[in-house]
Interface confidence: low
């Protein structure tokens, strides 16, 4: 009789889930020399060992523990790059602005982005099927908690002014239930975070409203300003002449607002 | 270091149900799966199925009505029980430790153990 | 289910280069592992390449594996050719339900 598997809501584990993790690893530890010394092959064990033979609604922070110490990096603290719902830009600008760091330019976030994986309560069998989504299922699945326990240390980890690329097309610009909302908000420091500066990004080439008047973003600042960290909002009005003068600091139309 | 030694008995008749232990050292059987694998003659190499750490088992499609894995955590041991023998059963079955977990090979075979049913 | 096809005999002089080819009949050769063993007479099967092209550190750099997706192949490669690599080679992979699939064997000869 062959074992019911659960089937859930969402999409099944990535294809070459294993394959993929361990060549990043091994790409990502060539390129940065700093973390050549990391075993790729410990790393997958512990990436394994956080959901594999355990039930996918029943992840808990802990069991990416070993993960976590594997993957400790160091990161400049006055570096950091948060973004919410527009993550393409944002990486977009860390491969230009090379001293700025996203979660997924560091070594864990660069692992799993773009992936999803889920095991089975006791077998090791990973789901190619169907894995929990956080909404229809629940909310203790394996990539959601690990990515609320990376986002976790990546804000703590911060200090000095901190950068958050923000998704000016979206009726939220600021939204509560995301990872920026509901995890790193929170985990900024205030004792060693002086201020937040938000980047609302527009999409539109005739958008010349103020965005930072958004009421989402007046949310923003309130959570902020509660915690004692000071808050600060630029319109970004044009992504694509922002990113060129990144590039090119001194060319003569980027003295002009972008 | 890693081992694995498979036993039984070598020689069975037609209809009777074979019975071959694998024991291992030098690793837990709930850290690797192992895997069953037979080698009939002059044949290839035919996967059986495995137990894995958590304890269910797979079994391969072909073989599936006369197969039973199983294992003593204990012991570390893994038993192979294939029922109603058939002549064409007869060959060498080894054990065998999955490598790793993701890439599904194998990196240590038991010595292997001859199997033969006469009718 | 796919399958591994791999042809029954391969020979080569001393010193030379012989591939063994393996081809998988559906499906993506590039979605799983390839695997290749090394068995000679009445030993059990040595694993000499995993994950593809990866070489256990044992294993003599003779030996290297590939993939090739226009023919929907793996192959393994044995370079400078000696008498002890006369033995069958298996190439192994696995399907989605993580079943294991061997292919046929190819028994090499050194001439």
């Known amino acids: 009789v062959p074992r019911w598997r659960q089937q859930w809501s969402g999409p099944g584990t990535t294809k070459r889930f294993p394959e993929t993790v361990l060549a990043r690893c091994v790409k990502y530890t060539e390129i940065h020399p700093e973390m050549r010394h990391v075993d790729c092959q410990s790393v997958w064990d512990a990436f394994k060992g956080a959901f594999i033979s355990k039930h996918p609604c029943n992840i808990t922070e802990e069991d990416y523990q070993p993960l976590m110490k594997l993957g400790t990096q160091t990161v400049p603290c006055n570096k950091i790059l948060l973004w919410s719902r527009i993550k393409d830009l944002a990486h977009q600008f860390t491969q230009v602005q090379r001293d700025m760091f996203t979660l997924e330019d560091t070594l864990l976030g660069y692992l799993a982005d773009d992936l999803t994986w889920c095991g089975e309560f006791n077998t090791s069998k990973i789901n190619y099927q169907s894995c929990p989504d956080w909404r229809k299922d629940c909310s203790n699945n394996p990539v959601s908690v690990f990515w609320k326990t990376v986002s976790r240390r990546f804000a703590e980890a911060a200090c000095d002014v901190v950068h958050v690329m923000l998704n000016g097309s979206r009726s939220k610009i600021f939204d509560k239930n995301s990872t920026f909302g509901s995890v790193e908000v929170h985990n900024l420091q205030p004792e060693k975070v002086q201020t937040l500066e938000a980047w609302v990004i527009h999409g539109g080439r005739e958008d010349s409203r103020d965005l930072c008047q958004d009421p989402t973003i007046k949310e923003l600042e309130s959570i902020i300003s509660k915690r004692n960290i000071q808050f600060s909002c630029k319109n970004i009005y044009r992504p694509d002449k922002f990113l060129q003068c990144v590039k090119n600091p001194e060319d003569s139309s980027c003295t002009s607002e972008i | 270091q890693v081992q694995l030694k498979e036993s039984g008995p070598g020689l069975l008749l037609s209809s009777e149900t074979l019975s071959l232990t694998c024991t291992v050292s030098?690793?837990?059987?709930?850290?690797?799966?192992v895997s069953w694998v037979r080698q009939l003659p002059g044949r290839g190499l035919e996967w059986m199925g495995r137990?894995?750490?958590?304890?269910?088992?797979d079994y391969n499609s072909d073989l599936k009505s006369r197969l039973s894995i199983s294992r003593d955590i204990a012991k570390s041991q893994v038993f192979l029980k294939m029922s109603n023998l058939k002549t064409e059963d007869t060959g060498t079955y080894y054990c065998?430790?999955?490598?790793?977990?993701?890439?599904?090979?194998?990196?240590?075979w038991g010595p292997g153990t001859m199997v033969t049913v006469s009718s | 289910q796919f399958t591994l096809t791999q042809p029954k005999s391969v020979s080569g002089s001393l010193r030379s280069t012989i591939t063994i080819p393996c081809e998988r009949s559906?499906?993506?050769?590039?979605?799983?592992?390839v695997t290749w063993y090394q068995q000679h007479l009445g030993r059990p099967p040595l694993n000499v390449i995993y994950a593809d092209d990866q070489r256990p550190s044992e294993v003599s750099d003779r030996f290297s594996g590939s993939i090739d997706s226009s023919s929907n192949s793996a192959s393994l490669t044995i370079t400078n050719l000696q008498m002890d690599d006369e033995a069958d080679y298996f190439c192994?992979?696995?399907?989605?339900?993580?079943?294991?699939?061997f292919g046929g064997g190819t028994k090499v000869t050194v001439l």
């Open positions: 192994q992979s696995y399907d989605s339900n993580t079943d294991i699939i």
């Open positions: 065998a430790r999955a490598y790793g977990f993701n890439y599904w090979s194998f990196d240590f």
């Open positions: 559906s499906g993506d050769i590039g979605d799983n592992y």
């Open positions: 137990v894995w750490i958590g304890g269910d088992t």
């Open positions: 030098g690793f837990s059987l709930t850290s690797y799966e």
